[in-house]
Amino acid sequence: DCCSCQEKWVGYRCNCYFISSEQKTWNESRHLCASQKSSLLQLQNTDELDFMSSSQQFYWIGLSYSEEHTAWLWENGSALSQYLFPSFETFNTKNCIAYNPNGNALDESCEDKNRYICKQQLI
Amino acid sequence: ARHCGHCPEEWITYSNSCYYIGKERRTWEESLLACTSKNSSLLSIDNEEEMKFLSIISPSSWIGVFRNSSHHPWVTMNGLAFKHEIKDSDNAELNCAVLQVNRLKSAQCGSSIIYHCKHKL
């Protein structure tokens, strides 16, 4: 049914999320999400994950720097809104972005291991 | 925000249950009443997997398990004996149960702790 998420996924506001408890590199995380017909988290706004705003973990999200566009892009090619992470100008463009659902974001080496969040839109 | 599915708006769905993820702190009894007013129950834990999931969401929350005193057994809201281990049970002042990062422990029922509500689909 179009309103249901896969088993072990969280449904919230018409989206399904897989919240990993295992740690992976950014690339491993991206492939794991793709294998589940989803993509690494693309945030619409910082309260998108407010159901887990008490979490004190960081999670890989689907943001990477494009040399070609000289911009931070989501996996679908759309640009990062400058209002989402006010500190994004200080991010090292060689790094990937780890996000805490409280609204904090860090740039870390893509080879580092973090938990990750996959997202699927229901409709 | 759009709304889909079988759970109340702003609740989450997980494994055929709906969860209200509270951000406000309440005593155990206040939490019980708050969940009742939402036509649901104070959080119950059915298995290890659910406990792990909820621990990712929030570091601690009340669960619907209590005892009348340290001489009484731990029971669920429907009066059944609660089988799982609850830490610090030897302390006579701690008669309500809390989920705290992958383990269950006793706490003072009058403490202000975050609460979550649940109802099964």
Partner: antibody, heavy 120, light 107 residues
């Protein structure tokens, strides 16, 4: 169970060097940020440095920047701190520390500490 | 940098007393706060994380509360082994910082 054992401390003259090591066991070392924290005699706790899981993301306190180098060997479950151009104010007990599994930046486990004394 | 200020810097109390130590952050840190206990010659030990969550193995007489900028550590009934120095620490943003410590002494 989790164990962190530091070694390499000792007495050194100002301007000298020391290399601290920390042997980790009882957990998947490559899954955790690792930290060095120090405590001067009779004083409080001070963050010195930390290193990410792969060793690529590193932080140093301003007081040690350019003089200390943190590194890790995930194959050997070991953390290191190379300390050069040591000063009297670097005298402290140095603790190797591991993050808590739930809260990034909170120290869940500490080593027993190794004393570094910088004196002529 | 976020400054962490503990008060009092020292406190005298007796076995059985209820003791409260406060910690104030110079800016909001949500609930990214930890409390540690340190005894002379020993490494610190984690008591509380996420402002109010009790670390496994820590006695339930220890509790933490607060959010934002103001936090408290409470020991409900002091035991002889609780006389030590207590530190708060923020983990909200780099560089992570500790409070200056509160020494709890026997009256």
């Amino acid at each position: 169970q989790v164990q962190l054992v530091e070694s390499g401390g000792g007495l050194v003259k100002p301007g000298g060097s020391l290399r601290l090591s920390c042997a980790a066991s009882g957990f998947t070392f490559s899954d955790y940020y690792m930290r060095w924290i120090r405590q001067a005699p009779g004083k409080g706790l001070e963050w010195v440095s930390h290193i990410s899981t792969s060793g690529s993301t590193i932080y140093y306190a301003d007081s040690v920047k350019g003089r200390f180098t943190i590194s890790r060997d995930n194959a050997k479950n070991s953390l290191y701190l190379q300390m050069n151009s040591l000063r009297a104010e670097d005298t402290a007990v140095y603790y190797c520390a591991r993050d808590h599994y739930y809260s990034r930046g909170v120290i869940g486990y500490w080593g027993q500490g190794t004393l570094v004394t910088v004196s002529s | 940098d976020i400054q962490m200020t503990q008060s009092p810097s020292s406190v005298s109390a007796s076995v059985g007393d209820r003791v409260t130590i406060t910690c104030r952050a110079s800016q909001g840190i949500s609930s990214w706060l930890a409390w540690y206990q340190q005894k002379p010659g020993k490494a610190p030990k984690l008591l509380i994380y996420a402002a109010s969550s009790l670390q496994s193995g820590v006695p339930s007489r220890f509790s933490g509360s607060g959010s934002g900028t103001d936090f408290t550590l409470t020991i409900s009934s002091l035991q002889p082994e609780d006389f030590a120095t207590y530190y708060c620490q923020q983990a909200n943003s780099f560089p992570y910082t500790f409070g200056q410590g509160t020494k709890l002494e026997i009256k």
